[in-house]
């Protein structure tokens, strides 16, 4: 969370940004809020990126002004016009690229004053893992798969019964490059699993942490997975 203040004469407005992460190939949001202003035609929103000449996006007099937009962002940005009224200057970024990572500035001007705040935008790939029982193996094993990760993550297994146990000796993890030659498919197999136990497959890089849980009993298999972005908020 970054809060910036701007001063214009006696007036300053608070601008707040949230560090966020973009999943390459998907759409992302760079979050920014400001003190709402009743005079809508005086609201100017500018998004800038460190090291880039020109603007990422500009919204003024009620519409987008893309005359100074840098070509790497052409056709990929939008603000949520109906949210500007309530002080939301967040930027939608389509088809996130690895090169979109960096420091962005959300600059706001209203009839009350001006202000800005910076935002660190990380890019990578992250996806939810799915764990399945691998019945083909000679001994009962679990297979944890996640289709897209970048940078290369670490993978660790944990068990509810054997808490603190190190499963690296009884697991095998592989990373397979996807067709676009950036992201990788993560596959990890855990061997010698026991029934009536809950196992967790944890995949983590510097952008996200994902966990898949599986509980295997005689009668059923229960699965749960979650994904958490790191250093966000």
């Amino acid at each position: 969370l970054i809060i910036g203040f701007g001063i214009s004469g006696k007036h300053f407005i608070t601008v707040t940004t949230f560090t966020s992460a973009g999943n390459i190939g998907e759409d992302g949001t760079l979050s920014c809020t400001f003190e709402p202003d009743i005079k809508l035609n005086g609201i100017v929103i500018q998004w800038l990126k460190e090291g880039i000449k020109g603007l990422v996006h500009e919204f003024k007099e009620g519409k987008d002004d893309l005359s100074q937009q840098h070509e790497m962002f052409r056709g990929r940005t939008a603000v949520f016009a109906d949210q500007v009224v309530v002080g939301n200057a967040s930027l939608r970024l389509k088809n996130v690229q690895l090169t979109d990572a960096g420091t962005y500035t959300c600059y706001i001007r209203t009839s009350k004053g001006k202000g800005n705040a910076n935002l660190e935008y990380k890019t990578g790939a992250f996806s939810m893992p799915e764990i399945n029982v691998d019945y083909n193996a000679s001994s009962e094993s679990l297979r944890c798969e996640a289709p897209r990760w970048f940078p290369q993550p670490t993978v660790a297994w944990a068990s509810q019964v054997d808490q603190g146990a190190n499963f690296s000796e009884v697991s095998n993890t592989s990373f397979e490059l996807n067709s676009e030659n950036v992201t990788m498919k993560v596959v990890s197999v855990l061997y010698n699993v026991t029934i009536n136990n809950t196992y967790s497959c944890m995949i983590e890089n510097d952008i996200a942490k994902a966990t898949g849980d599986i509980k295997v009993t005689d009668s059923e298999v229960k699965r749960r997975s979650q994904l958490q972005l790191l250093n966000s908020g």
Partner: antibody, heavy 116, light 107 residues
């Protein structure tokens, strides 16, 4: 001097529609949103929705979604609020106001009575 | 939606005294809160926006405070024209929502 002038009082039958107009100054229309707020007899204020002609956006409260339509005619600087499928609970004073996010000038109000 | 509550529902105060009205939001609205005064048969009048900024023409004896979920409107040295109903309104998120009002009466 900012002024919002609304159309006159109406009596409507249940099931019918109502349409209230709100004439504003040109500056108000080009620079601000126009919202609609209603007040049932002896009750509090209830935001129905609003339009920001400069942004080309309109938002409605969930409660009225599908039953209310807010439009803006830039050429005459007039906003309209239409409410369909009227019922007795819609009897209220309907106000137009300059804003959101907050409302600094209000129309005089239009009393709409829904009765059979 | 964000639910606004106000307390007390009614308040009896003598002229010349101070009145403090409270408004609570069901979730944080930062400082995105406005206060209105309404007299019988009249449209509401904006008093405060941004939780603490007085609207044009509002006297200094009217002040607003608070942020997040708890807000107050204080009127010091009450005058006859101050007796009315007061509403708070959040504008952090759509839909904009009002509190049920506090009726300020002469004691």
């Amino acid at each position: 001097q900012v002024q919002l002038v609304q159309s006159g009082a109406e009596v409507k039958k249940p099931g019918s529609s109502m349409r209230v107009s709100c004439k504003a100054s040109e500056d108000t229309f080009s620079s601000y949103a126009i919202s609609w707020v209603r007040q049932a007899p002896g009750q509090g204020l209830e935001w129905m929705g609003g339009t920001a002609p400069i942004f080309g956006t309109t938002n409605y409260a969930q409660k009225f979604q599908g039953r209310v339509t807010i439009t803006a005619d830039k050429s005459t600087s007039t906003a309209y609020m239409e409410l369909s499928s009227l019922r007795s609970e819609d009897t209220a004073v309907y106000y137009c106001a300059r804003g959101g996010p907050y409302f600094d000038y209000w129309g005089q109000g239009t009393l709409v009575t829904v009765s059979s | 939606e964000i639910v606004m509550t106000q307390s007390p529902a009614s308040l009896s105060v003598s002229p010349g005294e101070r009145a403090t009205l409270s408004c609570r939001a069901s979730q944080s609205v930062s400082s995105n809160l406005a206060w209105y005064q309404q007299k019988p048969g009249q449209a509401p009048r904006l008093l405060i926006y941004g939780a603490s900024t007085r609207a044009t023409g509002i006297p200094a004896r009217v002040s607003g405070g608070g942020s997040g979920t708890e807000f107050t409107l204080t009127i010091s040295s009450l005058q006859s024209e101050d007796f009315a109903v007061y509403y708070c309104q959040q504008y952090k998120n759509w839909p904009f929502t009002f509190g049920p009002g506090t009726k300020l009466e002469i004691k």
